[in-house]
């Protein structure tokens, strides 16, 4: 009822502001708003086959507001742009396009990659790692004494994780063989007693070649190593220093 009264009023006064709805300053029954109240933006809205004028406090998606002396109007952003400051600077692209320097592109330029989360072209970020930390002490089963061969490890940190097209990170862990310090273990540092270290018999159905557990591995290695004379030990130590086995953790 109210709507029809409003419509009738507009028909009687086609260009008088009292008969207009919303922020219209002047209007017509057929075209809707013809001009807007101060600070409001004029936009054309398509309804079926005709366009009617509307007055808005801010322009709809895909349009931006421009203030001229005679009219504040909503102007269309470029076809591939969803929101923009003006024709030159898009701030959000339509689906399937990537934002780069205020423009919308279907593919990012050379040297840049598409961020599918922000839908922007971004610089390719390569992995960056710190310098290696010092080697850890040479240990064998957590002990730093005895004449056994052990391992030492060093690590480095990832300072910058790579982006999708960036170079992968190099290994961040490195392990190499070494010879544990030439000092006798103190009483508390000694390993388990010999009989506890004896090789277990394989379970039924278990292959004789099954990898021995670390305890049996230790006992089996101990015997020949203990038999070595001083000369051989020295030789082995030099060889071990030269041999550096890397265990890589790739990110």
């Amino acid at each position: 009822q109210n709507a029809s009264r409003g419509r009738r009023q507009r028909r009687m006064h086609p260009n008088v502001s009292q008969g207009c709805q919303g922020g219209c300053a002047t209007c017509s029954d057929y075209n809707g708003c013809l001009s807007c109240k101060p600070r409001l933006f004029f936009a054309l809205e398509r309804i079926g086959m005709k366009q009617i004028g509307v007055c808005l406090s801010s322009c709809p998606s895909g349009y931006y507001g421009t203030r001229y002396p005679d009219i504040n109007k909503c102007t269309k952003c470029k076809a591939d742009c969803d929101t923009c400051f003006n024709k030159n600077f898009c701030t959000k692209c339509k689906s399937g396009f990537y934002l780069h320097l205020g423009k919308c592109l279907d593919n990012c330029p050379e040297g840049l990659e598409a961020n599918n989360h922000t839908m922007e072209c971004v610089s390719i970020v390569h992995c960056e790692v710190s310098e290696w930390n010092p080697w850890s002490p040479c240990t064998k089963k957590g002990k730093t004494c005895g004449f056994k061969r052990g391992t030492e490890t060093r690590v480095r940190e990832i300072i910058q994780h790579p982006s999708a097209k960036g170079n992968l990170c190099p290994p961040t862990n490195e392990t190499r063989k070494c010879t544990v310090q030439r000092k006798k273990c103190q009483k508390g540092e000694r390993g388990k007693k010999g009989r506890e270290r004896k090789r277990k018999k394989p379970n039924k159905g278990e292959s004789k070649e099954a990898i021995p557990d670390s305890k049996s591995l230790e006992s089996s290695k101990e015997i020949p190593e203990q038999r070595e004379n001083k000369q051989q030990q020295k030789k082995r130590k030099v060889q071990d220093k030269q041999k550096s086995v890397s265990v890589s953790t790739v990110h």
């Epitope: 003006n86 024709k87 030159n88």
Partner: antibody, heavy 116, light 107 residues
Framework: EVQLVESGGGVVQPGRSLRLSCAAS????????MAWVRQAPGKGLEWVAT????????YYRDSVKGRFTISRDNSKNTLYLQMNSLRAEDTAVYYC?????????WGQGTMVTVSS | DIQLTQSPSSLSASVGDRVTITCRAS??????LAWYQQKPGKSPKLLIY???SLIHGVPSRFSGSGSGTDFTLTISSLQPEDFATYFC?????????FGQGTKLEIK
């Protein structure tokens, strides 16, 4: 790459006329509102006139209304400023620029000196 | 017409300094404010629009703030290439007007 190149500046006597041109390239000229902005020697920037993309509406600062006319030829990608009845206070570097709220792209400017 | 008043008119600073330039409007211009940089003999270059939106390619040491009538341009750590004249501009109302400029010089 957007390029705006002004020409037509020079030394002219008060009361005489001058026509400035601005050749545009690297963008769709007919999509953009264009403007002239001037800068007197050692002074600030002053908007002079704007013409909307299709040439149907023009706007001027009060001090040049009735003396200056801004126009464009979209088929030639060229903007013009016809300056009549020139005064000493019109002496400035005249820049053409795209005008879409802000002045995003500028030419290198052309110097106009009004002196007897 | 809306008047824009910049302060200071000129400013001496050193590389690495933090610098602030202010722009005051004679009436409310909401967030319709831009900043330009101009080097001697060159045309102005747009840096910031809508008070604080940086143009692509402008270093992040430049930032803008404010609303209504009071606005600031801040350069967090001056670089040699930043010594220039800076202008504010309002586009809330015709005629679009500029501040008188702030000349940033090397101390």
């Amino acid at each position: 790459e957007v390029q705006l190149v002004e020409s037509g500046g020079g030394v002219v006597q008060p009361g005489r006329s001058l026509r400035l041109s601005c050749a545009a390239s690297g963008f769709t000229f007919s999509d953009y509102d264009m403007a002239w902005v001037r800068q007197a020697p050692g002074k600030g920037l002053e908007w002079v006139a704007t013409i909307i993309y299709d040439g149907s509406r023009t706007y001027y600062r009060d001090s040049v209304k009735g003396r200056f006319t801004i126009s464009r030829d979209n088929s030639k990608n060229t903007l013009y400023l016809q300056m009549n009845s020139l005064r000493a206070e019109d002496t400035a570097v005249y820049y053409c620029a795209t005008h879409d709220k802000t002045f995003d792209y500028w030419g290198q400017g052309t110097m106009v000196t009004v002196s007897s | 017409d809306i008047q824009l008043t910049q302060s200071p008119s000129s400013l001496s600073a050193s590389v690495g300094d933090r610098v602030t330039i202010t722009c005051r409007a004679s009436e409310d211009i909401y967030s319709d404010l831009a900043w330009y940089q101009q080097k001697p003999g060159k045309s102005p270059k747009l840096l910031i629009y809508d008070v604080n939106s940086l143009i692509h390619g402008v270093p992040s040491r430049f930032s803008g703030s404010g609303s209504g009538t009071d606005f600031t341009l801040t350069i967090s750590s001056l670089q040699p290439e930043d010594f220039a004249t800076y202008f504010c501009q309002q586009y809330d109302n015709y005629p679009n007007t500029f501040g008188q400029g702030t000349k940033l010089e090397i101390k």
